[in-house]
């Protein structure tokens, strides 16, 4: 299963982290799928290590464990953040994070 | 015994095609990541592109994106790269490269085949 | 992209010596680098994964060290066969990178 807050918020210009826990006693992940709404964010593979999304490059830096720090945030980054946990063999699991970046004070 | 062999290489013109071919023998292809890696003339290695065993993700350098495409048929147990708008910064020896499982290195190389990119 | 300089370029060496190579990181990739040896003409071959595994095959006289930004691949006694371009590879992130290779020659 995946484990996750679901809603989350941070200051805009600040940093957050977004984190999928997965638990299972079989299963090992293979990879793991970060996603803003439709767009890839980032990429982790047992086989291939991270990709960032160039488009993120700059502001997506891989961990800790297998999720993102998002940094110098800014009000357009508010909406949906998936993770999908590939896993062999329990299959696939998906994760949803809502991130409300605010006006900082 | 485990072999690559590559193929498809030849002299073109800038802005025109190629489609490089690299026939896998003596272990499961379907099962591996697969790279091509490449080589200009006196000068080091640099990585191109990769593609998922069943073939759903590809990623590639910033140099050659948009440009050229990675994709395989492993009932022909082969992997290709369409390589378009060529440059003569695409001259090279290209090679497809598979990886020991987990680890991130690359263990087996085809001899490599050669791009000249040339007017 | 993650830069890797190795040094030194080149290295003039004798048969039975002692050679290390280094490699740096610009930024942390863990354990994930790999050596590889090249001689003209031919494909690289690979010596040490995961910084400091053996690859099947590879005589012991190679070994690798480091983790994080510093990686050394070190020939304890150097062959004939040895003489070659040497070069490291990070793999913690995508796209992996290559070094700008280390050329050992006879002295």
């Known amino acids: 299963t995946i484990d996750t807050k679901r809603n989350i918020s941070a200051e805009e210009g600040g940093s957050v982290i977004l984190q999928c826990h997965f638990s299972s006693d079989t299963a090992e992940v293979t990879q793991v799928d970060w996603k803003q709404q439709d767009q890839l964010l980032a990429i982790y593979s047992v086989d291939l290590g991270w990709h960032v999304a160039s488009v993120f490059s700059d502001r997506v830096v891989p961990g800790p464990s297998l999720g993102l720090t998002f940094q110098s945030l800014t009000m357009n980054d508010t909406g949906e953040y998936f993770c999908t946990y590939h896993t062999y063999p329990g299959g696939i699991y998906k994760g949803r994070i809502f991130l409300k970046v605010q006006e900082s004070s | 015994e485990v072999q690559l062999v590559e193929s498809g290489g030849g002299v073109v013109q800038p802005g025109r095609s190629l489609r490089l071919s690299c026939a896998a023998s003596?272990?499961?292809?379907?099962?591996?990541?697969m790279h091509w890696v490449r080589q200009a003339p006196g000068k080091g290695l640099e990585w191109v592109a990769v593609i998922w065993p069943d073939g759903s993700n590809k990623l590639y350098a910033d140099s050659v994106k948009g440009r050229f495409t990675i994709s395989r048929d492993n009932s022909k147990n082969t992997l290709y790269l369409q390589m378009n708008s060529l440059r003569a910064e695409d001259t090279a020896l290209y090679y497809c490269?598979?990886?020991?499982?987990?680890?991130?290195?690359?263990?087996?190389w085809g001899q490599g085949t050669m791009v000249t990119v040339s007017s | 992209d993650i830069q890797l300089t190795q040094s030194p370029s080149s290295v003039s060496a004798s048969v039975g010596d002692r050679v290390t190579i280094t490699c740096r990181a610009s930024?942390?990739?863990?354990?994930?680098l790999a050596w590889y040896q090249q001689k003209p003409g031919k494909a690289p071959k690979l010596l040490i994964y995961g910084a400091s595994s053996l690859q099947s095959g590879v005589p012991s006289r190679f070994s690798g060290s480091g983790s994080g930004t510093d990686f050394t691949l070190t020939i304890s006694s150097l062959q004939p066969e040895d003489f070659a371009t040497y070069y490291c590879q990070q793999a913690f992130y995508l796209p992996w990178t290559f070094g700008g290779g280390t050329k050992v020659e006879i002295k």
């Open positions: 003596g272990f499961t292809f379907g099962s591996y990541y």
């Open positions: 490269a598979k990886p020991v499982p987990k680890s991130r290195a690359l263990d087996v």
């Open positions: 930024q942390g990739i863990s354990s994930w």
